[in-house]
């Protein structure tokens, strides 16, 4: 085997907004660094037969298999895939290698299989075998990190019992309210399961894996802060952890924290207790209630007391499954062509939802904000004053909700015309509804102000795209009118939009738009 | 389920005193605490002061020395004692023990 060649097997995968890949076969453009597939010696094959190593590959994802060549001189190639030929372009690199490249846009179902490259170099013959298959994303979770108490340490871990295994993060933030946004720079990211500094204002664990990223927040009540008009409600099901941490600073150590369930204090070994004394030598106090496994009846107000501070509490509800509790009747709204104005759906739902907004097959992100209430609200704002039908869908792992919306834009008619043999048609979109007047122009009416009654009929909303509203009028043709212009008018509250029609024999109609 | 009722309220001349009073009944406790609230017209809600079931108190800072909260446990009831009412005092006051609210009582100090 002294004289086979040095080859590289390489997957190149490509970041999927590179609308580059596939512009040209041998280099698309942005892409992850290559990662090597080995290509080993396939023993006991008849010929020389080397074998990459396996390719799993995402749903849609586009990758390059990749071929690198160390011989002598030119060589030719050949793809085979499902007994198929394709055809094989080497080029050379600066290293003076052959390399060939197989380009797969938008993984499916088809494209998986066995890829064949045939080589032929001065020196030998050779065959390459890629196998790519889709990677199954079904047997893929990702479930909301929890947290555990590390044994004994005064330490928390995160949990995510995911697949793929997930990389947990900690985010700190310890300034209030709007400053601790996840690009804020007073949030701190740990790439760490234990977490020890358990005293900032704001503590959350994130997991993420390749179906993307889920938080749970740490629930504190914190005792210097003016209680609130709502009470914090905090939900769980039936047989996940609760946690509450209580917080409270003081000018020195001369104060404690108890919990208590309904007016009875905690189980020992349902609490513990942290101090520290902060950098102005203030005393800060926090103490954990956990339950590790929550049952109907852990259901009930927690209340932090402290002899220094006012005391404040959390109802804390345990369900049997998950919920989305919003109205889902329908909402029209009616706006002018430049108005401000946003969709909006407050819901109260546990566990945490994901959620789309769709307006005419497209769908579009969702963000979701909590309010002080418990609720969160979901706003949508980017409907670039497009009438029509916009939903609202959410779901979470026990419960799914759709909510569908109406868009009217108020503005004057557009009328488009057509044609045929027997009748004329005019068609208009303008909101509100249009209605409808046919004139006659003729010798006797050079500015088309003879009405036509006889034979019209219109046609409230009888199309309806994407829930946008069209109305329509016909005028069916007779001896009287044949051979004369007629014009088509919509008006609404808004304005006017005519077009002209020649009504001649059969043929091409010219219409004359007038507004 | 727990019901409140809060009295006393009424008009007064600045510089005077009243004595709210909230009932407690139903499902409640001698353990659970008592906050007051109040709404003038216009304006969010906000916290007056709390009594813990140990009988401890806290005030909203700037209401401290003129307003002073108790409480009979025999009697599921809670007081808060307002002396030298200014006009900025006027508002409905409101007792809550838990998530449950009174109905409120109107606080009017006239200058």
């Known amino acids: 085997n002294q004289d086979l060649p040095v080859i590289k097997c390489v997957l190149i995968n490509h970041k999927n907004n590179d609308s580059s890949v596939g512009k040209s076969s041998s280099y698309p453009m942005v892409s992850e660094s290559p990662e090597d597939l080995g290509c080993a010696l396939r023993p006991q094959s008849s010929g020389t037969v080397y074998e990459a190593a396996a390719v799993e590959v995402d749903v849609s994802a586009s990758i390059t298999l990749q071929v690198l060549v160390d011989a002598p001189g030119n060589i030719s190639c050949l793809w085979v895939f499902k007994h198929s030929s394709l055809n094989c372009q080497p080029h050379f690199d600066l290293q003076n290698r052959g390399v060939v490249s197989m380009v797969i846009l938008k993984m499916t179902e088809t494209q998986a299989g066995e890829y064949l490259l045939f080589i032929q170099s001065e020196a030998t013959n050779y065959t390459i075998l890629f196998t790519v298959s889709i990677r199954n994303t079904l047997l893929y979770t990702l479930r909301r990190p929890y947290f555990r108490k590390m044994e004994n340490q005064d330490a928390l871990v995160c949990i995510s019992e995911s697949v793929p295994e997930p990389i947990v993060e900690w985010v700190l933030c310890d300034s209030q309210g709007e400053s601790c946004k996840e690009e804020s720079p007073a949030v701190v990211k740990k790439e760490e399961k234990v977490l020890h500094e358990l005293f900032g204002t704001d503590i959350r664990c994130c997991a993420r894996n390749e179906l993307g990223r889920e938080c749970t927040r740490l629930f504190t009540i914190d005792l210097n802060q003016t209680p609130q008009t709502t009470l914090p409600q905090l939900f769980l099901k039936v047989g996940e952890p609760l946690w509450i941490r209580c917080k409270a600073v003081h000018v020195n150590h001369g104060f404690g924290l108890t919990w208590e369930l309904e007016n009875k204090a905690l189980e020992e070994g349902n609490y513990f207790e942290m101090s520290t004394y902060s950098t102005n030598r203030t005393m800060i106090r926090i103490l954990f209630a956990f339950v590790s496994s929550v049952a109907r009846n852990d259901t009930g107000y927690y209340t932090c007391s402290s002899s220094k501070h006012p005391s404040q509490s959390a109802l804390v509800t345990i369900v049997e499954k998950g919920f989305i509790n919003a109205t889902n009747s329908s909402e029209d709204y009616e706006i002018d062509q430049y108005e401000e104005f946003c969709f909006s759906v407050r819901f109260k739902a546990y566990p945490q939802i994901r959620c789309t907004w769709t307006f005419s097959r497209k769908s579009f992100p969702c963000e979701q904000k909590g309010l002080d209430n418990g609720y969160s609200i979901s706003k949508f704002c980017n409907h670039k004053h497009q009438p029509g039908e916009y939903i609202f869908h959410a779901e979470n792992d026990d419960a799914q909700f759709t909510k569908m919306f109406t868009l009217n834009i108020r503005r004057k008619p557009q009328v488009l015309a057509e044609a045929s043999a027997s009748q004329a048609s005019c068609f208009s979109d303008g909101y509100p509804l249009p209605s409808w007047t046919w004139k006659k122009c003729s010798d006797k009416s050079p500015n088309c102000t003879e009405e036509i009654t006889e034979g019209v009929w219109n046609r409230k909303a009888n199309r309806k795209v994407f829930g946008q509203w069209v109305s329509s009028s016909t005028l069916n043709m007779s001896e009287a009118i044949k051979g004369f212009l007629v014009k088509c008018c919509a008006y609404n509250s808004l304005g006017t939009s005519c077009e002209t029609i020649l009504l001649n024999s059969p043929g091409p109609f010219p219409f004359i738009q007038d507004n | 389920q727990v019901q409140l009722q809060e009295s006393g309220g009424g008009l007064v001349q600045a510089g005077g005193s009243l004595r709210l009073s909230c009932a407690a009944s139903g499902s409640t406790s001698s353990r659970n605490y008592i906050d007051w609230y109040r709404q003038a017209p216009g304006k969010q809600r906000e916290w007056v002061a709390q009594?813990?079931?140990?009988?401890?108190?806290h005030y909203e800072p700037s209401l401290k020395g003129r307003f002073t909260i108790s409480r009979d446990n025999a009697k599921n009831t809670a007081y808060l004692q307002m002396n030298s009412l200014k006009p900025e005092d006027t508002a409905v006051y409101y007792c809550?023990?838990?998530?449950?609210w009174g109905q409120g009582t109107q606080v009017t100090v006239s200058s």
């Open positions: 009594i813990t079931s140990g009988g401890n108190t």
């Open positions: 809550r023990i838990l998530d449950y």
